[in-house]
């Protein structure tokens, strides 16, 4: 038996045009192997007329293709202008004709409806342009040009070459004469819409030696495609309208009671508050195509949805549409994980993230999500050691715990880190994944030094103090840098005296450096961990400066540590004017234009459909 | 919401006929995909066929499971929301509980999708 697998039977009428699917096992070979349509010969040979190495009969030439999808397993061969002669036996195959890795396929070609002798048939999408071509002898080059719509019983004048449009097609038809050269007038209809469909006669001339051309135009409604996605995951909906409206606004709205289509998302700024922090419109290409990335899915996010463009950004009638209907899996393969994570001002956040366990050496990157215009999402972080300029010392992505979840560490908040961030990675671009960061009122939980500077060739030691609250942890002390926070010995010094309220389960952990060099400048953090998962944590910043005086420095929480020009806070803790320190991040504007990874490689810079699309899949 | 009701099933012998209907309400008929699949006891649910319509190109597609081509024969009525899957020369081995489906052609093979399925008509084939 074939594992090959399509439709035995495909019916159609002439003049129209088939997809026929065929699906294979995915495996390396069978994608990359070489993919037929053949026509069964009465004697049992099987005559190719295209395959994916580039051939096409000459029967099929102008009218067929075929395209693998390797990803999906299949192949789909499309044939246009179908006629009778068409009918026949098939086969769709992988490899050579004859080998048997193929499908029958039965296609039935029969006559269209009764249309006029003489009518050529126009299918058009709705919201699209038609040019229908109405030609003419000689005789009638001077005469009256014009074009009817049958309705009912009687035609009616929809535009003609004295200048009469019909009110029902104002500012969207136009009859063009051609050249003297060429017998042939055409009308042009813009913005089509479902009424403009039916019969037309177009005439040149107007007595009895008038020559005249029937049209059928049908006018289709997009059939929504069937799109499938977990509960938690992603969709993207990639919509081509065509050059055409490349410069018109666009937008993706979901279909509510009756014809009400309710905006999503615009190029013009509106967007759904339903969708905030969950919603990329990615920018136009040059031809007006343009995706829509919904992450986070909810239940109620299933529906239809339709993107168009029409200079209102919403939907009106002649607007050229593509459908969708999106159904949301609650069956999900993505794990549930918080949608919102909450951390106070000066403390710390951990964020868990899926992905597809299957995945595990792709590449995993975490973004903020923006607002502003269409959305966008600037990346922060990779798992490649690239970590934007101004998050240096205070983020870490872990590939901790794996096995389906990587975590994101981000430390020294403030209210300004308070928002919408993705978890994404260069595979399965279905699991985007969204978290809400809230800033809270509170105090962090762990307590260090506010900065640090250690002397050249001595030994340095920093205090890190954890309440009660984390006597089960497991307590670390790591020195950051962009691939992650490399673990250090650290002392238990006993239980800690900084906290009220709090008893002997309380603990001070200090980090020793001995005999400090250059190298030891930097961000350090402490933190609490269970295995593999990852809790709070606090970040210093070690300086390091020449030799003034013999002995070691023990960096305390008291006052007597505070530096000129730091503001000491009652508790013993300082808060470090801007001009006190040398803080790297106080330099992150410098920083972000000589990061040259951070400009030149567009795909790191801001997540679009283009950072992590690239790999194929769309809305399904 | 769509909404899936089957009728039509019940006892026949074998070599016999039956005709199954799926009746559809709720949603757009003519932009789904339709499909049979069947149940028998102790078994797994299994691929019995499936009918494909583009009202764009005015085309449709009809697929098999390879137990049934040539016996079984699977036709929609738009203008009656209906499916139905005309069974001949019936073996014991059919007897199952079918099921209308929508479906979804995705990845390599026929997948359904177990929001919308009718109750199922028990189909009994006697020796």
């Known amino acids: 038996k074939s594992p090959i697998f399509g439709p035995e039977e495909v019916n159609s009428v002439e003049g129209n045009s088939v997809s026929i699917t065929c699906y294979y096992p995915p495996t390396s070979v069978n994608r990359h192997t070489r993919k037929y349509w053949c026509r069964q010969g009465a004697r049992g040979g099987c005559i190719t007329l295209i395959s994916s190495e580039g051939y096409v009969s000459s029967k099929y030439a102008g009218r067929a293709n075929l395209t693998n999808f390797p990803e999906n397993g299949t192949f789909v061969v499309n044939i246009a202008q179908l006629s009778q002669d068409d009918s026949g036996r098939y086969k769709c195959g992988l490899g050579i004709n004859s080998r048997g890795l193929s499908f029958d396929v039965s296609l039935e070609v029969s006559q269209g409806p009764g249309l006029l002798n003489d009518t050529k048939v126009y299918t058009v999408d709705l919201g699209r342009t038609v040019t229908i071509n109405c030609p003419f002898k000689t005789e009638n080059a001077q005469k009256r040009k014009s074009l009817y719509k049958q309705i009912g019983l009687y035609p009616v004048l929809v535009i003609d070459s004295s200048g009469y449009v019909n009110p029902n097609y104002t500012g969207r038809i136009r009859l063009d004469i051609q050249g003297t050269g060429q017998l042939l007038f055409s009308v042009v209809i813009n913005q089509l819409r479902l009424s403009d469909a039916g019969q037309y006669l177009c005439q040149a001339g107007d007595d009895s030696n008038s020559n005249k051309k029937n049209a059928d135009l049908q006018v289709l409604k997009p059939e929504p495609e069937l799109v499938y996605e977990d509960l938690r995951g992603s969709v993207t909906f990639h919509c081509a309208l065509g050059p055409e409206v490349a410069n018109v606004a666009k937008f993706l709205c979901r279909q509510s009671s009756g014809e009400n289509c309710d905006v999503v998302v615009n190029t013009l700024g509106k967007r759904a508050p339903a969708f905030e922090g969950r919603i990329l419109l990615n920018p136009q290409d040059k031809d007006g195509s343009f995706s829509v990335v919904i992450t986070g899915l909810r239940k109620e996010d299933a529906g239809r949805y339709l993107c168009g463009a029409h200079s209102d950004g919403q939907l009106q009638e002649g607007s050229p549409i593509q459908a969708w209907q999106l159904f949301v899996n609650e069956e999900s393969t993505i794990p549930r994980s918080p949608t919102v994570v909450k951390g106070v001002a000066g403390g710390s956040v951990a964020v868990l993230c899926p992905y597809n366990r299957k995945e595990s050496k792709s590449i995993k990157y975490w973004c903020l999500w923006e607002g502003a215009q269409n959305g966008r999402c600037p990346l922060l972080v990779d798992s490649e050691g690239w970590v934007k300029a101004q998050y240096e010392g205070r983020l870490s992505l872990l590939e901790e715990p794996g096995n389906g979840t990587f975590t994101v560490i981000l430390n020294q908040l403030t209210s300004r880190d308070a928002g919408f961030y993705w978890c994404l990675t260069n595979g399965d671009t279905l699991w985007r994944t969204t978290v809400e960061i809230k800033i809270i009122e509170g105090e962090p939980n762990l307590k260090v030094p506010g900065n640090v500077t250690a002397v050249l060739g001595e030994t340095l030691k920093v205090p890190c103090h954890f309440p009660c609250k984390f006597s089960s942890y497991e307590k670390y002390w790591c020195k950051w840098n962009n691939t992650g926070c490399q673990a250090l010995p650290s002392q238990d010094e006993g239980p800690s005296k900084a906290f009220v309220n709090c008893d002997e389960n309380s603990r001070l952990v200090s980090l020793t450096l001995n005999l400090v060099t250059r190298a030891d400048e930097g961000w350090y953090w402490c933190g609490v961990k269970q295995g593999h998962f990852y809790g709070e944590t606090a970040a210093v910043y070690v300086a390091v400066e020449e030799r003034k005086a013999a002995g070691s420095r023990d960096v305390s929480l008291a006052k007597a540590d505070a530096a000129p020009d730091e503001k000491v806070l009652d508790s013993g803790f300082r808060e470090i004017e801007n001009k006190a320190i040398q803080d790297p991040r106080l330099f992150a504007e410098e920083k972000a234009v000589a990061d040259t990874r951070d400009q030149a490689d567009g795909s790191r810079a801001s997540v679009d459909s283009g950072s992590s699309e690239e790999q194929g899949g769309s809305s399904r | 919401q769509l909404q899936l009701v089957e009728s039509g099933g019940g006892l026949v012998q074998a070599g016999g006929s039956l005709r199954l209907s799926c009746a559809a309400s709720g949603r757009t008929f003519s932009t789904s995909t339709m499909g049979w699949f069947r149940q028998a006891p102790g078994k797994e649910r299994e691929f019995v066929a499936a009918?494909?319509?583009?009202?764009?190109?005015?085309?449709?597609?009809?697929y098999y499971a390879d137990s049934v081509k040539g016996r079984f024969t699977i036709s929609r009525d738009n203008a009656r929301n209906t499916v139905s899957l005309q069974m001949n020369s019936l073996k014991p081995e059919d007897t199952a509980v079918y099921y209308c489906?929508?479906?979804?052609?995705?990845?390599?093979?026929?997948?359904?999708?177990?929001?919308?399925w009718g109750q199922g008509t028990q189909v009994t084939v006697s020796s």
């Open positions: 009918i494909q319509w583009s009202s764009a190109s005015a085309s449709t597609y009809y």
């Open positions: 489906a929508n479906l979804v052609f995705r990845v390599g093979a026929l997948k359904e999708r177990d929001d919308y």
